[in-house]
Interface confidence: medium
């Protein structure tokens, strides 16, 4: 028989983690494995048909993606949709596929909304999702004794698909669910310095444990301004939500693992400011299969897609598409063996959910709602040399924090700052006022 996989991803723009130039080679490698393994879909041929999720400008589009999906559905009647990755593109496609009872498999669509499976039935996310970031942050808060207050800041940049809005939404909602905690959130425009000033005025009254989603440059600017305003001392901690670790990469950007460094005359101050900073990223898989997969992926991307893949965490997305597709094919194989058909979307999807799988990204666990458990890393600066390194990892499957042995979290006080100042945010603690009065008497 024939099994058709309908791809709805950006076909021209290579900048997205889920661009076809990146995911295509991963799909090729997965299908090559299917061919090579007699236990996967014996006697079947798997073919891919392509539709673009981007508009004429190469930007993800909530119009182009569903139109492409509809065209592919009527023309090819696919057994499964692969993608989209962008939130606004994936939302209408996911609603259509739910209506058609066709499985949708993606390693993108990380926003909180896709976890609502009555709306996005048969949507499986084999990649990371933002609510899972909330699980990590909640575990971190419990471990470090921060169970009362946090502040989340997120940047808005025109044309960036509101990545930070969705990230903070997932984080905010999950942390509030997991902990009985007050969480404030503020938006700011990256290109408007007056917004930064407003944030700095608000910060002292809203939080000491602060999460910031922004570009690396905006985060550095905020840290420099915070230092100037005296907010970078031992009482504050700033977490940069830099999930793909852009700020930690070399090449054209900042020096490897020195996210404060720019060579612009402000490095000394920036390094000092970054003593109060930590960075949260996805965890880079460290299993040997992943490294081997990356070698093949890069080679194939260059040979067949004329695309040079850079190193970095962004490669976990094509790798997750690869693992997700193999998991789907495994589920189809089992469904057929039990007398089902490739069009039995519900049965196939149920076989993918609440299941573990050994993939190129390592041990992969899809939860009971069809979302992958996600691993994260926390990076911290060694004050002696200014370099950031992973100090602890979060295992999404076991939901445990795993300290990297022999490495320490750096706290200027020697221990984490309290999430609420000793006298409260507005000096409202009567005991503090009492002390103050007694010194005047």
């Amino acid at each position: 028989g024939n099994l058709t996989v309908a791809v709805v991803l950006p076909l021209a723009n290579t900048s997205y983690p889920w661009s076809w130039a990146r995911v295509g080679p991963a799909v090729e490698l997965a299908l090559a494995q299917v061919k090579a393994r007699p236990d996967l879909l014996p006697g079947w041929t798997v073919r891919t048909v392509l539709g673009s999720s981007e508009n004429a400008l190469g930007v993800c589009s909530d119009t182009a993606a569903p139109l492409a999906a509809v065209d592919l559905k009527w023309e090819h009647n696919p057994a499964v949709f692969l993608g989209p990755g962008c939130v606004y593109a994936a939302a209408p496609v996911g609603r259509f596929t739910a209506h058609w009872r066709v499985p949708l498999l993606t390693a993108g669509a990380p926003a909180l909304g896709f976890g609502v499976k009555d709306e996005y039935a048969l949507t499986t996310r084999a990649g990371p999702s933002y609510a899972k970031l909330g699980d990590f942050v909640a575990a971190l808060h419990r471990r470090l004794g921060w169970e009362r207050q946090a502040l989340m800041l997120y940047a808005y940049r025109p044309g960036d698909e509101e990545h930070c809005f969705f990230l903070v939404e997932g984080l905010f909602m999950r942390v509030r669910d997991r902990l009985n905690i007050t969480v404030d959130h503020l938006e700011f425009a990256e290109d408007d310095l007056s917004h930064y000033t407003r944030l700095l005025r608000t910060m002292p009254r809203k939080g000491r444990v602060i999460y910031i989603c922004s570009s690396p440059d905006a985060f550095r600017t905020l840290m420099l301004l915070a230092l100037e305003a005296g907010l970078c001392g031992e009482d504050y901690v700033f977490f940069h939500l830099d999930i793909f670790g852009q700020s930690l990469q070399g090449g054209q950007g900042p020096a490897p693992r020195r996210p404060w460094e720019r060579g612009d005359g402000q490095d000394v101050s920036a390094r000092q400011a970054f003593q109060a900073a930590k960075i949260i990223t996805y965890k880079d898989p460290d299993n040997p299969e992943y490294l081997e997969f990356l070698k093949q992926l890069k080679h194939l991307a260059y040979e067949q897609f004329n695309f040079t893949m850079e190193d970095g965490l962004v490669n976990t997305i094509p790798a997750s598409f690869h693992d997700g597709l193999l998991l789907y094919i495994q589920a189809v194989t089992e469904t057929l063996a039990h007398g089902g058909t490739v069009t039995d979307g519900e049965n196939i999807t149920q076989r993918m959910w609440n299941r573990s799988f050994q993939g190129v990204t390592g041990y992969l666990k899809i939860d009971s709602s069809g979302d992958r458990e996600t691993d994260f890393s926390l990076w911290d600066m060694d004050p002696e040399n200014g370099a950031f390194r992973v100090v602890l990892n979060y295992n999404g499957t076991s939901q445990e924090l795993v300290a990297v042995s022999g490495r320490k979290l750096n706290w200027p006080l020697g221990y984490p700052p309290p999430d609420i100042p000793k006298c409260g945010f507005d000096n409202e603690d009567p005991a503090c006022n009492q002390d103050h009065l007694s010194t005047l008497e």
């Epitope: 471990r143 470090l144 004794g145 060694d382 004050p383 002696e384 040399n385 602890l392 990892n393 295992n395 076991s398 445990e400 924090l401 795993v402 300290a403 990297v404 042995s405 022999g406 490495r407 320490k408 979290l409 750096n410 706290w411 020697g414 221990y415 984490p416």
Partner: antibody, heavy 124, light 107 residues
């Protein structure tokens, strides 16, 4: 009472193997990294290996890398040191110690609690 | 690896004396320095962590300080039970390393 108790030390021939155990009690075992340290007769202290609280991260001194393996069982509150291809220079008293990780309200205590040690002699 | 150079290797002192032992790291180790006391046939006992903080139950006659990569252990008034060997240890990063030890003997 917080306690660590090593066992498994013995006389063994060069090239042989031995497995040391460290039993912990009186504290939440999984909250602590665990360390093996050895002391050769009349000599100083040498860090041998460390394992994180969840067991997901281990590290070794160059002198034992590839020969020794540290593991832990957080259900049994125990840590182990599997020593293979033993050499005469591995002769020592082996101590296990705990080390706090991710402390909440204080600085890192370092290795605050040690066991009483178990003696390993490698000789033909 | 980070080298820890401890001095002196031995010191003779009398009961009631004040004794200072120093330790120098070959590179920066933040505040992650501990001091241990060891008596013959016994396990090391932690006295000080974080360069200057006393472990609980340790008498206040023991104190520690830091100046850059130089660390000091001071015992303010020696008692008979203080005669032992003292080690410094860095726990900034693996491999953890110890000083060679300072043997404190009764004069």
């Amino acid at each position: 009472e917080v306690q660590l108790l090593e066992s498994g030390g013995d006389l063994v021939q060069p090239g042989g193997s031995l497995r040391l155990s460290c039993a912990a009690s009186g504290f939440t075992f999984s909250d602590y990294a665990m360390i093996w340290v050895r002391q050769t007769p009349g000599k100083g202290l040498e860090w041998v290996s460390g394992i994180s609280g969840g067991g997901g991260s281990t590290d070794y001194a160059d002198s034992v890398k590839g020969r020794f393996t540290t593991s832990r069982d957080n259900v049994k509150n125990a840590m182990y040191l599997q020593m293979n291809s033993l050499r005469t220079e591995d002769t020592a008293v082996y101590y296990c110690a705990r080390e706090d990780q991710l402390p909440s309200y204080h600085n890192y205590y370092g290795m605050d609690v040690w066991g009483q040690g178990t003696t390993v002699t490698v000789s033909s | 690896d980070i080298q820890m150079t401890q001095s002196p290797s031995s010191v003779s002192a009398s009961v009631g004396d004040r004794v200072t032992i120093t330790c120098r790291a070959s590179q920066g180790i933040n505040n992650y320095l501990a001091w241990f006391q060891q008596k013959p046939g016994k396990a090391p006992k932690s006295l000080i962590y974080g360069a200057s903080s006393l472990q609980s139950g340790v008498p206040s006659k023991f104190s520690g300080s830091r100046s850059g990569i130089d660390f000091t252990l001071t015992i303010s008034s020696l008692q008979p039970e203080d005669f032992a060997t003292y080690y410094c240890q860095q726990y900034n990063s693996y491999p953890y390393t110890f000083g060679q030890g300072t043997k404190l003997e009764i004069k």
